[in-house]
């Protein structure tokens, strides 16, 4: 899947664009909004009716090296009495993000963009029930 | 930056960390090509904290289309199908990395950008405080 070229309907390519070899692109990995932080203080992963845990995956050949994945704690959802209700389902909510993958081929190094599917949290859903005919 | 293991047989590189600027293959390695959450599941409708999905489009960004969730209700849907306002629907937010064209409008020059997106909603139990 290639990154789409800038459409001429939007704008013309400026003269100031850096020269880039064919089949590749220049990527500055100094992140814009690097210091932006999600407010994790809300602690919703424990207070949700479909609670979840976090696991940190670490890969030294990936940028960023740390990716946090959520896993639903229960199959069912937590009811008002604090008990698990198996008639409902805790399900993962997922979101794609981009990472840069570093690949070693002998002594040379190349970089590849990769889409990674991250499980962000869980939500409680009503299942669609099918009875035997 | 991050430290990476070097092949001991290779000449010493000047930096063990990721360089600030890299040349990247235009092809994105990925199995998950479905970026429209409406097609991937109907959780947004069947959740006890359902949400609507809003399309955010920006031609200067890759991916140019990002779907943002907005909780449909303040409360959560109970077993009777009614909204229970003693519970709360809250957004689940996630920081993701996208590509920003830099300089602007350039077809093959980008910078990583971190953005905060609401991915969906979950139902939470509040701590209740009655008047003393």
């Amino acid at each position: 899947r290639k990154i789409p070229k800038v459409g001429h309907t939007f704008f013309q390519k400026p003269e100031s664009c850096p020269p880039v070899p064919g089949g590749s692109m220049k990527l500055d990995i100094g992140i814009i909004n690097e210091n932006q932080r999600v407010s994790m203080s809300r602690n919703i992963e424990s207070r949700s009716t479909s609670p979840w845990n976090y696991t940190v995956t670490w890969d030294p050949n990936r940028y960023p090296s740390e990716v946090v994945q959520a896993q639903c704690r229960n199959l069912g959802c937590i009811n008002a009495q604090g008990k698990e209700d198996i008639s409902m389902n805790s399900v993962p909510i997922q979101q794609e993000t981009l990472v840069v993958r570093r690949k070693h081929q002998g002594c040379s190094v190349s970089f590849q963009l990769e889409k990674v599917l991250v499980t962000v949290g869980c939500t409680c859903v009503t299942p669609v029930i099918h009875h035997v005919q | 930056g991050i430290t990476i293991p070097r092949n001991p047989g290779c000449p010493n590189s000047e930096d063990k960390n990721f360089p600030r600027t890299v040349m990247v293959n235009l092809n994105i390695h990925n199995r998950n090509t479905n970026t429209n959450p409406k097609r991937s599941s109907d959780y947004y409708n069947r959740s006890t904290s359902p949400w609507n999905l809003h399309r955010n489009e920006d031609p200067e960004r890759y991916p140019s289309v990002i779907w943002e969730a907005k909780c449909r209700h303040l409360g959560c849907i109970n077993a009777d199908g009614n909204v229970d306002y003693h519970m709360n629907s809250v957004p689940i937010q996630q920081e993701i990395l996208v590509l920003r064209r830099e300089p602007p409008h350039c077809p093959n020059s980008f910078r990583l950008e971190k953005i905060l997106v609401s991915v969906g909603c979950t139902c939470v139990t509040p701590i209740v405080h009655h008047v003393a």
Epitope: - | V124, P126, I127
Partner: nanobody, 120 residues
Framework: EVQLVESGGGLVQPGGSLRLSCAAS????????MGWFRQAPGKERDFVAA????????FYADSVKGRFTISRDNAKNAVYLQSNSLKSEDTAVYVC?????????????WGRGTQVTVSS
């Protein structure tokens, strides 16, 4: 802690109007929502209307839609309930609430309530 002070209740004739006010003070820097429930004698406390702080979206119980309007004043951290075309079944104690994000949890705070009586 968050304190809620309601005002504006009273006796009104059927078809009349009232404007209820609720002002929040204390740790209200991260309000999620504010609104109103009501409780008639011998009945459960029922949701009336609320407003979400992040985007100003308003939510109403079916029984008051088209007659009641909720609004807010961000600077004063206050909500208002404009009640028109009042009916006898609107008689109740109207209780203000606020959902506030704390350091580790979302908290629901209740006010004392203000009496609304609709009678001729």
């Amino acid at each position: 802690e968050v304190q809620l002070v309601e005002s504006g209740g009273g006796l009104v004739q059927p078809g009349g109007s009232l404007r209820l006010s609720c002002a929040a003070s204390g740790r209200t820097f991260s309000t999620h929502a504010m609104g109103w429930f009501r409780q008639a004698p011998g009945k459960e406390r029922d949701f009336v209307a609320a407003i979400r702080w992040s985007d100003g979206s308003s939510f109403y119980a079916d029984s008051v839609k088209g007659r009641f309007t909720i609004s807010r004043d961000n600077a004063k951290n206050a909500v208002y309930l404009q009640s028109n075309s009042l009916k006898s079944e609107d008689t109740a104690v109207y209780v203000c609430y606020a959902d506030v994000e704390g350091p580790t949890a979302l908290h629901k705070y209740w006010g004392r309530g203000t009496q609304v009586t609709v009678s001729s």
